[in-house]
């Protein structure tokens, strides 16, 4: 059992709206019927996450780009290392929630 | 548009089952009726996540502990810095999925 308490200022700083690494499961649907399996079956990308200081605000991306990554595509007759492109967030902002 | 491709070994090294920082929304229900708002309204903890090299395996925690953190509890007549305890994962494992 951990005795130490994480101070509020640290809790708040870590939780605030910012780009953070998240795990994204890879969808086979993207690949058509030929591909039987993707390895790895998930990837990590930077996405906006965390919370805003006010219930009326939400954490949204204000800067994004595509990141390309190599993925092993298991298929028949032959497998290959292919490429996949996913959206990554580079900047975030707390903005009023859309009504 | 990013030209560089993330190499496959780097992709899977990041994506593999391991403890990683995740955002957990805080539930007001835990606090009873007195507390009107928690600040922050979410916290970050280490939890097992990512994928395993085989479809028959899943990423599960094998080492966990409680982490205590300070949370600002907005209530009437007076607000205060309270403490909250959440489960954190320190070790993970790829284990055969339960049938």
């Amino acid at each position: 059992h951990q005795k130490k308490v994480v101070p509020w200022i640290d809790v708040y700083a870590r939780a605030t709206c910012q780009p953070r690494e998240v795990v994204v499961p890879l969808s086979m649907e993207l690949m058509g019927n030929v591909v039987k399996q993707l390895v790895p079956s998930c990837v990590t990308v930077q996405r906006c996450g965390g919370c805003c200081p006010d219930d009326g605000l939400e954490c949204v991306p204000t800067g994004q780009h595509q990141v390309r990554m190599q993925i092993l595509m298991i298929q028949y007759p032959s497998s290959q290392l292919g490429e996949m492109s996913l959206e990554e967030h580079s900047q975030c902002e707390c903005r009023p929630k859309k009504k | 548009h990013q030209k560089k491709v993330v190499p496959w070994i780097d992709v899977y090294a990041r994506a593999t089952c391991q403890p990683r920082e995740v955002v957990v929304p805080l539930s007001m229900e835990l606090m009873g009726n007195v507390v009107k708002q928690l600040v922050p309204s979410c916290v970050t903890v280490q939890r097992c996540g990512g994928c395993c090299p085989d479809d028959g395996l899943e990423c599960v925690p094998t080492g966990q502990h409680q982490v205590r953190m300070q949370i600002l509890m907005i209530q009437y007549p007076s607000s205060q810095l309270g403490e909250m305890s959440l489960e954190e994962h320190s070790q993970c494992e790829c284990r055969p999925k339960k049938k």
Partner: antibody, heavy 120, light 107 residues
Amino acid sequence: QVQLQQPGTELVKPGASVKLSCKASGYTFTGFWIHWVKQRPGQGLEWIGHINPGNGGTNYNEKFKRMATLTVDKSSSTAYMQLSSLTSEDSAVYYCARSYSNYVRAMDYWGQGTSVTVSS
Amino acid sequence: EIQMTQTTSSLSASLGDRVTISCRASQDISNFLNWYQQKPDGTVKLLIYYTSTLHSGVPSRFSGSGSGTDYSLTISNLEQEDIATYFCQQGKTLPPTFGGGTKLEIK
């Protein structure tokens, strides 16, 4: 950082068995296959087999099927290879290495190797 | 099993040279070709996988190319620390098989 630790040397008598260890650290042990590779003095590399620590699944090179047995101890993040009925032909350096997939089989980290000498 | 052949078992070159090491597979391995470096002390490192993808931390003077059955590793500007034996390995089918190695020496 990722490390695969192997003992430096083992001296065994002909006909005996030896159990080699490979202790993994710096990553989730059950998330990667562990391979074993043999190298005779001045020779090339020969793949013996590999094990998936997550479920204990193994594949062996036909040549080594009878003499090698691969196991893991998840609690200590250690892979083992037992070699039985040893002869002088089995005097070699034995490496453990890891790979993520049973497809590309690119072994991204290797142990330092254990030198096994079979001699009476 | 797939046979991997490195016809040149040893190679002498000068510092700064461009060096190419070849590897041939007994059948099409669909680019599932990896290169390893073994230093004189026995340390083995992955250099390149899937024919041409550089493993992280490997200097950019190393590059790989090829397709089908013929593959090569090129060191564009030979340095002292590159003195080692280089092995190719196919990862297409079980068992994975290695070439006999090419020992690189300084002239």
